[in-house]
Interface confidence: low
């Protein structure tokens, strides 16, 4: 609330704006009849330096000239870029209690002269747009700097616009607001940018261009596609463009793809035929435009057109597999399974499958359609049967895929040898085998089939399978493989009319089982004890059980227990032991072992054999 500069004045020499590295003299003078009231000779003028409103220095020692009690001159050096505030204050030395009184102040700006603007670039967006130019201003000047953009052209065309840069805004682009029309296509235009501030001025080199150099067409709009005769592979792409466009670039890709198909089209006039599209596929289309074949700039890409191509009839071969089960002496159940076609083969939404089971002599033919990927029928056990399946969408059906129904494990001579299953990582298993030793007919292919060994898996879940060429002896199975689950894996060797198989159990990862088998009964028969148990619940097995252990020890004994190890068989749930003393009470329990280790013990049962020792 002080009336600044009522007491005196502050002046700067050579000027309040100075180049970096220069010194300045600041003079502070009291107005007549101002100063300390009692003793004018005791007037002391001091100069304070502020940066960003913070006092950084008292320049008492920089005084270069002094008229006692009237005026003082101070020299300031090493000023940093930007603005510095200096405030002159009056200190009446006879009164220590009163603070110095502000007299007046001055701002000194330190900066540099502007560099010549460089890299001028001009653009007109669309035939009806206006010319806008941008440039590189060079080093920051730290001063308010004015920029003038001047354009000159044919027929005495001149135009200019101005803007300025300071510590709040940057000026490196100006829109001239004029439109260059196509009838000036061959004409040359010149622009230059001039920069000026309190320390100097500079000018860019002239920048010359033509209409074609700077006009960027607007991106095409109103894009649509028409599929010829509802074809899934051929379509006409149509769009709207500015009138002067002579060249278009089209790009298109399926939505899940990572690489574009690119096409250049000359004089397309908003229309182009595409012939290599994939049926029933979501595509994205974009178009860009150019006004001249050799010169000029491409427009931005248009907005995307996203659409799905129509369906076409399915192609490809279904992968079929089957299971046979004898029902009684003259009937068998055939379950056919097949894998869905991949999208490039299905070429549409599969509506149903046509399934045919035929006795080779053509006596009997069973036909049906199903929307599922499996089909089960009961047929006579006599005769040679063949199955075929085709897939149908709204446009037609695929060629039927045939498979001969043979006894899959009927020929021991065709059974693969040395089948092994090795866990590779959490979600796959490597199955290897050796070819059949004495096959009397050539192996046409191997089928590796697997399913989880859980209750009801044969009826509830279809098998998974892989077809392997006859010269391969390994398969990495990963479909539906989960850790801590035991799978039954079968390797089938198929000839034209016979099959042989070998089976193994395997898991991709294992842990020791959560619990041991539950002993349900102990019975004594012919001086042997039969231990009966229930298997460990499926979720608690945590991999393939290799074997069970039966432990026993005399009740109250501290000795290590005896044990008997039994190779695991799913069908077995009892086992005899014969090394127990009669009329001695034993405690018995069981554990289960996977490749990762042994389970905790199951329930304990006490039993006292009555027969005589073996």
């Amino acid at each position: 609330n002080i009336d600044v500069c009522k007491l005196g004045t502050v002046t700067v020499q050579p000027a309040p704006v100075i180049p970096l590295g220069s010194a300045a003299n600041i003079s502070c003078s009291l107005n007549p009849k101002q100063g300390c009231s009692h003793y004018p000779s005791s007037n002391e003028l001091i100069l304070l330096k502020f940066v960003n409103d913070v006092l950084v220095e008292n320049l008492h020692g920089k005084k270069v000239h002094d008229h006692t009690g009237h005026s003082s001159t101070f020299q300031v050096t090493n000023l940093s870029l930007g603005m510095t505030l200096f405030v002159c204050k009056l200190n009446c030395s006879n009164s220590q209690k009163k603070p110095p009184v502000p007299v007046c102040g001055v701002e000194i700006s330190v900066g540099v002269a502007p560099e010549p603007p460089q890299n001028i670039s001009c653009v007109q967006e669309g035939e009806n747009g206006t010319v806008a130019c941008s440039w590189n201003s060079g080093k920051v000047t730290y001063l308010k700097t004015n920029y003038t953009l001047q354009l000159s052209g044919p027929n005495n065309l001149t135009c200019q616009k101005q803007c300025f840069s300071d510590n709040r805004q940057n000026c490196n682009r100006l829109d001239l607001g004029i439109n260059l029309s196509p009838d000036l296509a061959e004409s040359r235009f010149i622009v230059r940018v001039t920069a000026i501030n309190d320390l100097g001025n500079s000018s860019s080199l002239p920048h010359t261009f033509t209409f074609l150099d700077i006009v960027i067409p607007l991106p095409p709009w109103d894009i649509r596609i028409n599929f010829l005769n509802a074809s899934g592979s051929r379509g006409t792409l149509q769009w709207e463009d500015e009138g002067q466009v002579v060249l278009n670039q089209l790009r298109y890709q399926p939505l899940n793809s990572t690489s574009w198909n690119m096409v250049n089209a000359t004089n397309a006039k908003g229309k182009y035929d595409l012939r290599d599209l994939r049926p029933f596929t979501e595509y994205e289309f974009q178009i860009s435009s150019k006004l001249h074949l050799s010169g000029g700039s491409w427009s931005n890409w248009s907005e995307s057109l996203r659409t799905r191509t129509p369906e076409e009839e399915p192609v490809g071969i279904l992968d079929i597999w089957y299971m046979k089960q004898d029902i009684d002496y003259d009937r068998q159940q055939i379950s056919l399974f097949w894998k869905s076609l991949n999208p490039s083969e299905a070429r549409g939404k599969i509506l149903h499958y046509q399934v045919t089971l035929q006795e080779v002599t053509k006596k009997t033919t069973l036909q049906n359609t199903t929307r599922h990927t499996s089909w089960t029928r009961v047929i006579p056990r006599t005769g040679a049967w063949t199955a075929s399946v085709s897939a149908a969408n709204s446009k037609g059906a695929s060629a039927p895929t045939h498979i001969n129904i043979v006894d899959l494990c009927g020929t021991g001579l065709l059974a693969p040898h040395q089948v092994s299953a090795k866990s590779e990582n959490m979600d796959n298993i490597l199955v290897t085998w050796q070819p059949p030793k004495k096959a009397d007919s050539a192996v046409r292919e191997y089928i590796v089939e697997w399913r989880a060994l859980q209750p009801g898996s044969i009826t509830k879940f279809p098998p998974h399978w892989l077809r392997i060429p006859p010269d391969n002896m390994s398969a990495l199975i990963s479909e539906n493989i989960k850790p801590y689950i035991c799978y039954e894996i079968r390797v089938h060797a198929l000839s034209e009319s016979q099959g042989g198989c070998s089976s193994i159990r395997g898991d991709s990862k294992h842990k020791a089982p959560v619990s041991g088998p539950h002993i349900t009964a102990i019975t004594e028969k012919k001086e042997r004890l039969f231990i009966s148990w229930t298997h460990i619940p499926f979720p608690e097995q945590r991999g393939c059980i290799l074997h069970y252990r039966i432990y026993w020890k005399e009740r109250d004994s501290t000795a290590q227990p005896e044990l008997c190890e039994i190779q695991y068989r799913r069908s077995q749930n009892s086992h005899p032991i014969s090394s127990l003393q009669p009329r001695v009470t034993y405690v018995l329990w069981m554990t289960a072992v996977t490749a990762a280790g042994e389970s905790p013990q199951g329930n304990e049962r006490e039993f006292c054999p009555q027969g005589k020792a073996n």
Epitope: Q560, E562, C564, E565, S579, V593, A595, E598
Partner: nanobody, 123 residues
Framework: QVQLQESGGGLVQTGGSLRLSCAAS?????MAWFRQAPGKEREFAAV???????YYANSVKDRFTISRDNAKETVYLQMNNLKPEDTAVYYC????????????????????WGQGTQVTVSS
């Protein structure tokens, strides 16, 4: 054929510790340590069956710990509070076939043997 390679033996003072390792070149089910002191017969020290069932000779119980890393097919014998009478050549033994009714104490139950590693406990 499974090869066994022992390591970790050496000279240690009474009351000290050592850790022996035995790496198998294939999958095994039971892995055991036996030891043979100078002028004596080879004797059972410890066995691990499956992943976690362990048995020890009375002479090493509460001082030795047997463990295994199934992923590496390696068995370890951590020997603490060693005594001069623990001085011996320590042998690793393994069985790939699961034995029927033994408990892993008997040498005859093992198909595969390592070359041995010397452990010397000085007083």
């Amino acid at each position: 054929q499974v090869q066994l390679q022992e390591s970790g033996g050496g000279l240690v003072q009474t009351g000290g510790s050592l850790r022996l390792s035995c790496a198998a070149s294939g999958r095994t089910y039971a892995m055991a340590w036996f030891r043979q002191a100078p002028g004596k017969e080879r004797e059972f020290a410890a066995v691990i069956i499956g992943g976690d069932r362990t048995y020890y000779a009375n002479s090493v119980k509460d001082r030795f710990t047997i463990s295994r890393d199934n992923a590496k097919e390696t068995v370890y014998l951590q020997m603490n509070n060693l005594k001069p009478e623990d001085t011996a050549v320590y042998y690793c033994a393994a069985n790939r076939r699961l034995y029927n009714s033994g408990r892993g104490y008997s040498q005859s139950e093992y198909e595969y043997w390592g070359q041995g590693t010397q452990v010397t406990v000085s007083s």
